[in-house]
């Protein structure tokens, strides 16, 4: 999906009001020095592409993020504020239902959510290179 035509300001408002708080809740008990951000993004569409990938695509050691509250709210925000996004997700959702697993918060998941917080931070304030 091409995130270029999303309403970035509406997504940002949704992030600040709810999604960010759910991410903080998920990370509660984790030291702020624990994880270094290794995933980066260069502009808002790129940030949303990376956010979608880390939130909804199962990775080795962390298969369960898509059912978390922050993930469901992220999906809702993208469906509302990105034209045509929900249509592209129907097949992906059906595939995800087939491989749904029990929710387990692993250290790998905590690291992945820390990366998500970093991506959202850059989405909110993309630091473009100065000419």
């Amino acid at each position: 999906y091409d995130f270029t035509n999303c309403d970035f300001e509406k997504i940002k408002a949704a992030y600040l009001s709810t999604i960010s708080k759910d991410l903080i809740t998920y990370m509660s008990g984790t030291k702020s020095t624990e994880f270094n951000n290794t995933v980066s993004c260069s502009n808002r569409p790129h940030c949303l592409t990376e956010i979608q990938s880390l939130t909804f695509n199962p990775t080795a050691g962390c298969a369960s993020l898509a059912k978390e509250m922050f993930a469901m709210k992220t999906k809702a925000a993208l469906a509302i504020w990105c034209p045509g996004y929900s249509e592209t997700q129907i097949n992906a959702t059906q595939a995800m239902k087939k491989r749904r697993k029990r929710k387990v918060t692993t250290n790998k998941c905590l690291e992945q959510v820390s990366q998500l917080q970093g991506l959202w931070r850059r989405f909110n304030r993309p630091l473009l290179k100065q000419q």
């Epitope: 300001e9 270094n36 980066s40």
Partner: antibody, heavy 119, light 107 residues
Framework: QVQLQQSGAELVRPGTSVKVSCKAS????????IEWVKQRPGQGLEWIGV????????YYSEKFKGKATLTADKSSSTAYMQLSSLTSEDSAVYFC????????????WGQGTTLTVSS | DIQMTQSPASLSASVGESVTITCRAS??????LVWYQQKQGKSPQLLVY???NLADGVPSRFSGSGSGTQFSLKINSLQPEDFGNYYC?????????FGTGTKLEIK
């Protein structure tokens, strides 16, 4: 806990340069932008610029291009601001500040470094 | 660059009163506005981000509102510790700029 510890007050001559430091602790230094802000005595806040400690990318206010140079040392978790060709107009308190978890504000500030430029 | 204008520049109020400070942006900044409080000789402290979200530890008597170009910070039932300087700042795009400031004094 998160702390930004700035270097002490400076009294310098006009025409010289000065380097102010901002040592970060209590968080992953490279994950968050560091901003610098100027405040003249009895005046408001003025945004100088920002640095991404991970990449070294910087962005300056037009007014401070050529005046301020921002750098960061990842190994010591320290951000620096060098001010050059100093004049009395540069006399002020300079703050460093860390961007918040959400990237939508500054949640922690240094205590400020007072710079006095006088002959 | 986006200009931020605060009003009033100063105001006097008594403990227990309510006050409102306004901030106007020279162009649409959506909800990308922050409010800080600064006491004499101290660093600024974050009060509100995203125009209406209260920062951690900030008393509920503070509230932010507005979007686009017009914003306000309301303080209900003023307490002695609320007196000082208040600044808005836009967080829309780099370069960021601060408002002109409002000095809140005890009457």
């Amino acid at each position: 806990q998160v702390q930004l510890q700035q270097s002490g007050a400076e009294l310098v001559r006009p025409g010289t340069s000065v380097k102010v430091s901002c040592k970060a602790s209590g968080y992953a230094f490279t994950n968050y932008l560091i901003e610098w802000v100027k405040q003249r005595p009895g005046q408001g806040l003025e945004w100088i610029g920002v640095i991404n400690p991970e990449s070294g990318d910087t962005y300056y206010s037009e007014k401070f291009k050529g005046k301020a140079t921002l750098t960061a040392d990842k190994s010591s978790s320290t951000a620096y601001m060098q001010l050059s060709s100093l004049t009395s107009e540069d006399s002020a308190v300079y703050f460093c500040a860390k961007e918040s978890l959400t990237g939508s504000s500054y949640d922690y500030w240094g205590q400020g470094t007072t710079l006095t430029v006088s002959s | 660059d986006i200009q931020m204008t605060q009003s009033p520049a100063s105001l006097s109020a008594s403990v227990g009163e309510s006050v409102t400070i306004t901030c106007r942006a020279s162009e649409n900044i959506y909800s990308n506005l922050v409010w800080y409080q600064q006491k004499q000789g101290k660093s600024p402290q974050l009060l509100v981000y995203g125009a209406r979200n209260l920062a951690d530890g900030v008393p509920s008597r503070f509230s932010g509102s507005g979007s686009g170009t017009q914003f306000s910070l309301k303080i209900n039932s003023l307490q002695p510790e609320d007196f000082g300087n208040y600044y808005c700042q836009h967080f829309y795009e780099t370069p960021l700029t601060f408002g002109t400031g409002t000095k809140l004094e005890i009457k």
